[in-house]
């Protein structure tokens, strides 16, 4: 019963995971525009991994997609494929774990096969989780590299009488959504792999089991006890990697000038 | 057809005050962003207020900081500017605008008169 | 806060004639994230309310005339009128919509000869 809820707990938790990995790959608040020193700025400017918008007080919002692709920073690139990486992983590791759950029978299947499932499962969400933290932790590096770059370049070249401020950017929305994805994601697999210990079947072999009825000496011999616990030769482990590109048109939307009522 | 209607400007004593509305038809009024200027009876154009969409963020001149407040009725489709502790140098003609692509007004009323005198 | 200044104060013009009227800011209006310089250019005719000319530095309103063009980047800015009309005669006014408080300039009276 143990195991059931481990497991069961360990999928849901994957599944809000990854769910949290997309939706954090596919947002625009990557970096914002940091008001430390321009509080009440009427121009607000924002940045995804796959477009960059501005939003005006007036309400209009226009994003527009980068349509480069070897234009792009490295990083950029980078964190992109880290992302994708982990919702390849992480999906091809929910499709595993739904015919590795305990309370779905398919067929005729043996535990042993969803033990090694569960685990398969298990590994997946744990390089998802990792493949997310690791794209969100590179670009919270790049911004604040880029943060101190800009804040020296702030106080320089400031000889003239017009000053020229420059936009920098901090943290936005989608990094802490990733972070934490990532890390549900990572916590999911782990209770995958736990559950994967229990579901394994345990082999009790009698052998060399004799009785002889005309002496008094019995010899029992008794087999040796095996346990399968999923981490053993019998079980094959899958590492299944996988990658995706997407492209992003231009967006620009904002109501119409005539919006009547 | 886009029209803003401004009403409630008359003769008011200092730091007496006063509700300015701004009564929108055409558009919704909670999709844009709305300001509130000023023309001052030398001619000069100063901008007094905004409310951004959504109605979230409000903004102010240092003029009429903590003495004016912008407010927005999506029901009525009306916008207010509330003035409080009026001086003198509050006279003149108040304009209501609807925000569009970059933060510019395509659309203003005919204005209301406010004078401030004893 | 942005200070906006323009140029000249006044203008006395003949129709037909080309005009240039210049409006400059203490900062930049350019923003970076999508290139765009935030001044926007109006016309106020005596006794109406001003009317949108031109928005991000150089982008004409729908049913202004093109004889209307608006230019210049980062803090030094253009309204030139091409040719001048009888009904072109108005007060210009340049805006910073850039950062609060949006600030105008003082105006550019275009008189007829």
């Known amino acids: 019963m143990a195991v059931t809820a481990c497991q069961g707990l360990g999928f849901v938790v994957s599944l809000i995971g990854i769910a949290g990995i997309i939706a954090a790959t596919c947002m625009d608040q990557w970096s914002t525009q940091d008001l430390y020193n321009n509080p009440v700025t009427a121009v607000f400017n924002y940045q995804g991994l796959w477009r960059s918008c501005v939003r005006e007080s007036s309400g209009f919002t226009e994003c527009r997609g980068y349509f480069t692709l070897l234009g792009l920073p490295a990083m950029l690139q980078a964190v992109r494929a880290l992302m994708i990486v982990g919702i390849v992983l992480g999906a091809i590791g929910l499709l595993v774990s739904i015919f590795a759950l305990k309370c779905i029978r398919i067929g005729s299947m043996e535990d042993s096969a969803k033990a090694n499932m569960t685990l398969t499962s298990g590994i997946m969400f744990i390089v998802s989780g990792l493949c997310a933290i690791a794209g969100v932790s590179v670009f919270a590096n790049m911004l604040v590299t880029n943060f101190w770059m800009s804040t020296a370049n702030m106080y320089t070249g400031m000889g003239g009488m017009v000053q020229t401020v420059q936009t920098r950017y901090t943290f936005g929305a989608a990094l802490f959504v990733g972070w934490v994805a990532g890390g549900l994601t990572l916590i999911g697999g782990v209770m995958m792999c736990i559950a994967c210990r229990g579901l394994a079947p345990e082999e009790t072999n009698y052998k060399a089991v004799s009785y002889h009825a005309s002496g008094h000496s019995v010899a029992y011999k008794p087999g040796g006890f095996k346990a399968s616990t999923g981490f053993g030769s019998n079980t094959k482990n899958k590492k299944i990697y996988d990658g995706g590109a997407r492209t992003e048109d231009e967006v620009q939307s904002y109501p119409s000038k005539h919006d009547y009522v | 057809e886009v029209q803003l209607v401004e009403s409630g400007g008359d003769l008011v004593q200092p730091g007496g005050s006063l509700k300015l509305s701004c009564a929108a038809s055409g558009f919704t009024l909670s999709r844009y962003g709305m300001s509130w200027v000023r023309q001052t009876p030398d001619k000069r154009l100063e901008w007094v207020s905004t409310i951004i969409s959504g109605g979230i963020n409000t903004y102010y001149s240092d003029s009429v900081k903590g003495r004016f407040s912008i407010s927005r009725d999506n029901a009525r489709n009306t916008l207010y500017l509330q003035m409080s502790s009026l001086k003198s140098e509050d006279t003149a003609m108040y304009y209501c605008g609807r925000l569009y692509y970059g933060n510019a007004m395509d659309y203003w009323g005919q204005g209301t008169a406010v004078t401030v005198s004893s | 806060d942005i200070v906006m200044t323009q140029s000249p104060s006044s203008l006395t013009v003949t129709a037909g004639e080309k005009v240039t009227m210049s409006c400059k800011s203490s900062q930049s209006l350019l923003n970076s994230g999508n290139q765009k310089n935030y001044l926007t250019w109006y016309q106020q005719k005596p006794g109406q309310p001003p009317k949108l000319l031109i928005y991000?530095?150089?982008t004409r309103e729908s049913g202004v005339p093109d004889r209307f063009t608006g230019s210049g980047s980062g803090t030094h800015f253009t309204l030139t009128i091409s040719s001048v009309q009888a009904e072109d005669l108005a007060v210009y006014y340049c805006?910073?919509?850039?950062?609060?408080?949006?600030?105008f300039g003082a105006g550019t009276k275009l008189e007829l000869k």
């Open positions: 991000w530095a150089s």
């Open positions: 805006q910073n919509d850039y950062s609060y408080p949006l600030t």
